[in-house]
């Protein structure tokens, strides 16, 4: 990584290539998806603390004051009783039990310089302090936990600040070396890993630039860079000291922890933005890494500033290569407060994988110890730190990807931090511990948070072993399986768009002259009524369906167009004819219809205006009008349509009646009655002759606890299913009544004054009416929701369930943030089989939004994985799945980017992908199994070929 330039060694700065390389990478590329794999066998798992943050007992047992004691007194006056903090000094045994709980292989802690040497010089050691560190090290060795010891984590003895001006003074270099020498002599037999200084960037930048850290000086850039310079030289001196005097017999390693943010350019194609990113990284990480891990000098672009001290050639030699590994810190302190981050007009990012790649390119692929990583939670959060789990999961998976895909030599990981404690400028307003500590308590018990449980599991599993209970399988759906595609409301053509043979006149075309048509008088030709083929939109639609090779097509009728007045007084026969044409043209190609009578849309709920203005579904008369409308559709189309859906997603429609929760429940009640009446009408009047089946489709997303270590989240997931699906499914498919869990929960909230909701009661007559009014289970499934228990007291029905969603940042998600969670489909299907009678199940909508207009890779990935899970449900779990309808055929405004075809009917690549799935009826090496029989070959039509 060195290049000759005018006989001068200059470090190459290859890190810039990170942004140059950032061409488009598919979101479903295995290198981008969450990686289920394990870390290398010898990978080290650890946890860290900083002495000042956790030790407490700041004035006890002969410890001298540090610059941070002074800073707390002078700058953080609102901080009360900080003296004891987490009190690790007193409760060493409790810390050790916490380490045992996690099962870590190393513990990174720092020695408090003023606890060992109260006035900073090594003249007189504080025996009690020495005893504490000896006890800690002995206990770790006993437990087979490797100590990684930081010599300086910001708690400089106050005496050194007052006498010398602290790190601004070069005298500190020797004083620090004396202190380090003592530590090597005293503890070196038990310590194999040493860190000289923790994140020197923050020491200099916040200590002397922003004034946000001790000693709280601000605004003097010369001081900032002088401090940085002295820190580098102090580290370098200690490294040489260790290398020469201690390494030969102690055989340890020594480094310095360097911290950084990460930055992405506004526009990757803009070279200036890329250069700004490189400068941003160089001015933070490069400031210290270039001299130590690079060419012994500051990054070139920094040296143009007059405030940057110079290294002599001898000093460069002295400083260069003074680290045995790259110790790296990536956490909130380098990102917050955001106005102090060196952004250079670009965008900060939490992409740990990318920064590791930058380090690899910039510093010749060093061995890396992540010596601080984690995030923070608000102080009011006790043990349920759910977001911390997801941050950890995300960071750790990025590290794993860096190791497995990018061949980066990360050999250990330090979760930060073991215990809640003093968080520097945030004092006690944020928490970063894996263990919760009540600072006001006497005993300072260490209570494992969810993140501690999660990290323990990661350590046990050495990463992320594959979660699937069943690997992807080869297999096929039965021959009579319905492969479909769903459209929402099909807007009818009110008049024929391409009429043919409707004009009785004969014309002569003046081809050679003015090219006009002239009518031949006295001649009348036979005409014919308009035909289905005269509708351009139907022709287009059927072409799309044929291209997909689907066997079924689901679409919804437009109630408003068929019955504009909402009753049978005015029937638009032209519209009914259009729909009949859609069905018959499809049937000619072997494409059977599944027709939805009522598919609510947001604008006016899909109701005829008179019904809408008289209260819509809050008015029981709407159910009667719906019955009349359904009867008309059965009569006009039922000879051709064998699968009917009465209402699409009534469990979502009712949410639109959200003035109060009781409106929502009332609307839902009326929708169920309406559905049941229509089902009975069909059963009584039409089934005997038409032999069809009727259902309603429910929005059926799966739910999982966002935090599996918290029982309330499991209960919230259960509640979600009850309130979302069972709310309709129990009355209609099972008991004729609302789910017991739902009734009890609403009643309990009402009793406690947390809700004014009342579920309507089914009368005995209503209960009998609705129960069993389903011929098959139709479900629309899109994603899995990760849910949290959160008490909500607002007056709307969604508040009654006390459920909130959490976005899992580690999962592949669509632009509209639908998480791609295929196994949720299988779990849902199994749940339905267990809870409702063993009936036929149709997945009537399953799909995702994808911004790509041509190669829609997310959709293809989604289709493959979700159909795979449906297959497992069918073959392994014995679910009677009869059909799968992908969602949706074309784009529309209310559901942007969900279509297989663009709004101008261009096929995306998912069309061909889905048609292949259909051809092989699932997943097989050969095409569709011979037992199914191929459709008959097209027979040649002599007259047709003559005409063409």
């Amino acid at each position: 990584d060195y290049k000759d330039d005018d006989d001068k060694l200059e470090f190459s700065g290859d890190g810039k290539a990170i942004w140059d390389k950032k061409q488009y990478v598919s979101p479903v590329n295995p290198g981008q998806l969450f990686l289920y794999d394990t870390f290398p066998k010898n990978f080290s798992w650890g946890v860290g603390t900083g002495a000042f943050q956790v030790e407490g007992s700041w004035k006890a047992d002969g410890r001298g004051p540090s610059i941070w004691d002074r800073y707390v007194d002078s700058h953080l006056r609102g901080v009360n009783s900080t003296d004891r903090s987490t009190d690790s000094y007193v409760f060493l045994e409790k810390d050790l039990l916490a380490l045992d709980f996690l099962g870590v292989s190393f513990y990174q802690f720092s020695i408090s310089w003023p606890r060992l040497f109260p006035n900073g010089t090594v003249a007189a050691v504080n025996a009690k302090g020495l005893q504490y560190y000896r006890a800690l090290l002995d206990s770790l060795v006993l437990r087979n936990i490797e100590p990684i010891v930081t010599l300086y984590h910001w708690d400089l003895p106050l005496t050194l600040q007052e006498e010398y001006g602290g790190w601004k003074n070069a005298t500190m270099i020797d004083l620090f070396n004396d202190y380090a020498t003592y530590c090597f002599q005293t503890f070196g037999d038990r310590v194999k890993y040493w860190i000289t200084i923790h994140n020197p960037y923050l020491v200099a930048w916040h200590g002397f630039g922003t004034g946000m850290h001790a000693p709280g000086e601000k605004g003097n850039l010369t001081a900032v860079y002088t401090v940085g310079h002295n820190l580098i030289k102090a580290h370098s001196k200690v490294w040489h000291n260790y290398d020469k005097n201690f390494r030969p017999h102690q055989k340890g390693w020594l480094s310095i922890t360097l911290g950084s943010h990460w930055i992405e350019p506004n526009r990757t194609e803009n070279m200036e933005d890329v250069i700004n990113c490189q400068h941003s990284m160089s001015s933070v990480l490069g400031w210290f890494a270039n001299p130590i891990h690079g060419d012994g000098d500051y990054p070139e672009f920094m040296k143009t500033s007059s405030v940057i001290p110079e290294f002599s050639e001898a000093e460069k030699e002295e400083v260069r290569g003074t680290a045995d590994f790259f110790a790296f810190s990536f956490g909130p302190n380098n990102f917050r407060p955001s106005n102090t981050v060196v952004k250079m007009g670009q965008n900060v990012s939490l992409n740990l994988r990318q920064v590791l790649n930058w380090i690899k390119l910039e510093y010749d692929n060093p061995r890396i110890l992540i010596s601080e990583n984690g995030w923070f939670t608000d102080s009011y959060i006790k043990t349920e730190d759910t977001t911390a789990i997801y941050m950890m999961k995300n960071f750790l998976n990025q590290v794993l990807q860096a190791i497995k895909f990018d061949e980066i030599q990360v050999f250990g990981y330090t979760a930060w931090t073991l215990l809640d404690g003093f968080e520097w400028q945030d004092a006690y307003t944020t928490r970063r511990g894996l263990f919760y500590v009540d600072f006001n308590s006497e005993q300072k018990e260490r209570k494992p948070k969810s993140s501690a449980h999660y990290y323990k599991q990661i350590i046990q599993d050495n990463g992320f072993p594959l979660q699937e209970s069943t690997p992807d399988m080869k297999g096929q759906f039965p021959c009579d399986f319905s492969w479909g595609v769903t459209e929402s409301v099909l807007k009818p053509e009110f008049t024929v768009s391409s009429p043919q043979f409707t004009d009785p006149h004969l014309y002569v075309w003046n081809v050679t002259g003015n090219r006009l048509l002239y009518r031949v008088e006295g001649v009348r030709l036979k005409t014919r009524p308009s035909q289905c083929t005269d509708y351009v939109s139907i022709k287009k639609r059927v072409e799309m369906l044929a291209k997909m090779k689907v066997t079924h097509y689901q679409f919804a009728l437009d109630w408003t167009s068929i019955l504009p007045t909402g009753n049978l007084s005015k029937i638009n026969r032209q519209v009914l004819r259009y729909y009949r044409c859609v069905v018959s043209e499809g049937l000619k190609l072997g494409i059977s219809p599944m027709v939805t009578l009522y598919h609510p849309t947001h604008s006016h709920l899909g109701l005829p205006m008179p019904l809408l203005s008289s209260g819509g579904w809050l008015n029981t008369n709407t159910a009667k009008a719906f019955q009349d409308y359904a009867g008309l559709c059965f009569k006009e189309l039922g000879d051709l349509v064998k699968l009917w859906i009465t209402i699409n997603e009534p469990n979502r429609l009712s949410d639109m009646y959200n003035r109060t929760s009781n409106d929502t429940y009332r609307a839902a009640h009326n929708l169920m009655i309406a559905h049941a009446q229509v089902w009975h009408l069909y059963d009584r009047q039409y089934r005997p002759v038409q032999h069809g089946a009727v259902s309603l489709s429910l929005h059926s997303d799966w739910a999982e606890p966002a935090n599996p270590y918290v029982e309330s989240h499991w209960k919230a997931a259960e509640r979600f299913l009850q309130f979302e699906i069972a709310w309709f499914a129990d009355p209609l498919f099972k008991t004729g009544d609302y789910p017991l869990a739902m009734k009890e929960y609403i009643a309990s909230k009402k009793q406690r004054g947390l809700s004014s909701s009342v579920l309507p009661r089914f009368t005995l007559k209503e209960s009998r009416l609705v129960k069993g009014t389903i011929d098959f289970y139709a479900l629309n499934h899109f994603t899995t929701r990760f849910v949290i228990h959160k008490q909500l007291n607002t007056n709307c029905s969604v508040a009654d369930r006390d459920v909130q969603f959490l976005q899992d940042i580690t999962r592949l998600s669509s632009p509209s943030r639908l998480a791609v969670t295929p196994w949720g489909m299988r779990k849902l299907l199994g749940w339905i089989r267990r809870n409702y009678r063993d009936m036929d199940i149709y997945v009537t909508a399953n799909g995702i939004d994808d911004l790509a207009l041509e190669d829609d890779q997310i959709r293809k990935y989604y289709l493959e994985k979700y159909v795979q899970e449906a297959l497992k449900a069918y073959l392994i779990d014995k679910v009677k799945i009869k059909g799968y309808y992908a969602f949706k055929l074309t784009e529309e405004k209310s559901k942007p980017r969900f279509g297989f075809f663009t709004s101008d009917f261009k096929a995306k690549s998912s069309v061909q992908f889905y048609s292949k799935l259909i051809s092989s009826s699932g997943f097989s090496s050969e095409n569709r199994s011979p037992a199914c029989g191929q459709p008959p070959e097209d027979t040649e039509c002599a007259i047709c070929s003559f005409l063409t």
Partner: antibody
């Protein structure tokens, strides 16, 4: 309180069938599934099958050909029938309530057990 | 079928001491974040009694001296401290895959 009461014969002839009824109280069969488990000195605890709240059944593949579980929700009764018993089927047969939560697959209440001896 | 192997088959513990029972599965009983492992206690002449579900969750009414832990294929039931009333046979059971299977049992006695 939740109870599962079993009734059935104590002695069954080889090659004959065993029928056990399990009457439940204080919970509804439309909400909870019911499992059947047997315990013998030789084979320990063996899960035989389950009838879920919706009425679908899952059987241990080793018994699928000779086992039928059914129920009558209105009477709060679950019926267990096993055909072609052999002496190795001698055991205590338990009906037991499923935990009833989507995310917990466990048995939380057990019947008192029906001790069945297969002997001529 | 998934085989569950319990160890030891019997265990004698002094009152007030800790008892640890191990259950090893022939394949993982964890799926998508859920650990399908349950522990039961059975006293002579009685049906089994649910102690722990989902590997680590204490059934209501069960004393806090019972705890469960583990993941994937290795699980542990701990009783700490052991009381005289804890003399019984303890069974682990998996429900990740049909058929549900039980371990062979561990008999706990007082030393």
């Amino acid at each position: 309180q939740v109870q599962l009461k079993q009734s059935g014969p104590g002695l069954v002839q080889p090659s004959q069938s065993l029928s056990v009824a399990c009457t439940v109280s204080d919970f509804s069969l439309t909400t909870y599934g019911v499992h059947w488990v047997r315990q013998s000195p030789g084979k320990g605890l063996e899960w035989l099958g389950v009838i879920w709240s919706g009425g679908s059944t899952d059987y241990n593949a080793a018994f699928i050909s000779r086992l039928t579980i059914s129920k009558d929700n209105s009477k709060s009764q679950v019926f267990f029938k096993m055909n072609s018993l052999q002496t190795t089927d001698t055991a205590i047969y338990y009906c037991a309530r499923d935990y009833g939560s989507t995310y917990v697959d466990a048995i939380d209440y057990w019947g008192q057990g029906t001790s069945v001896t297969v002997s001529s | 079928d998934i085989v569950l192997t319990q160890s030891p088959t019997s265990l004698a513990v002094s009152l007030g001491q800790r008892a640890t029972i191990s259950c090893r599965a022939s394949e993982s009983v964890e799926s998508y974040g859920n650990r399908y492992m349950t522990w039961y206690q059975q006293k002579p002449g009685q049906p089994p009694k649910l102690l722990i579900y989902r590997a680590a969750n204490l059934q209501s009414g069960i004393p806090a001296r019972f705890s469960g832990s583990g993941s994937r294929t290795d699980f542990t039931l701990t009783i700490d401290p052991v009381e005289a009333d804890d003399v019984a046979t303890y069974y682990c059971q998996q429900s990740n895959e049909d058929p549900w299977t039980f371990g062979g049992g561990t008999k706990v006695e007082i030393k």
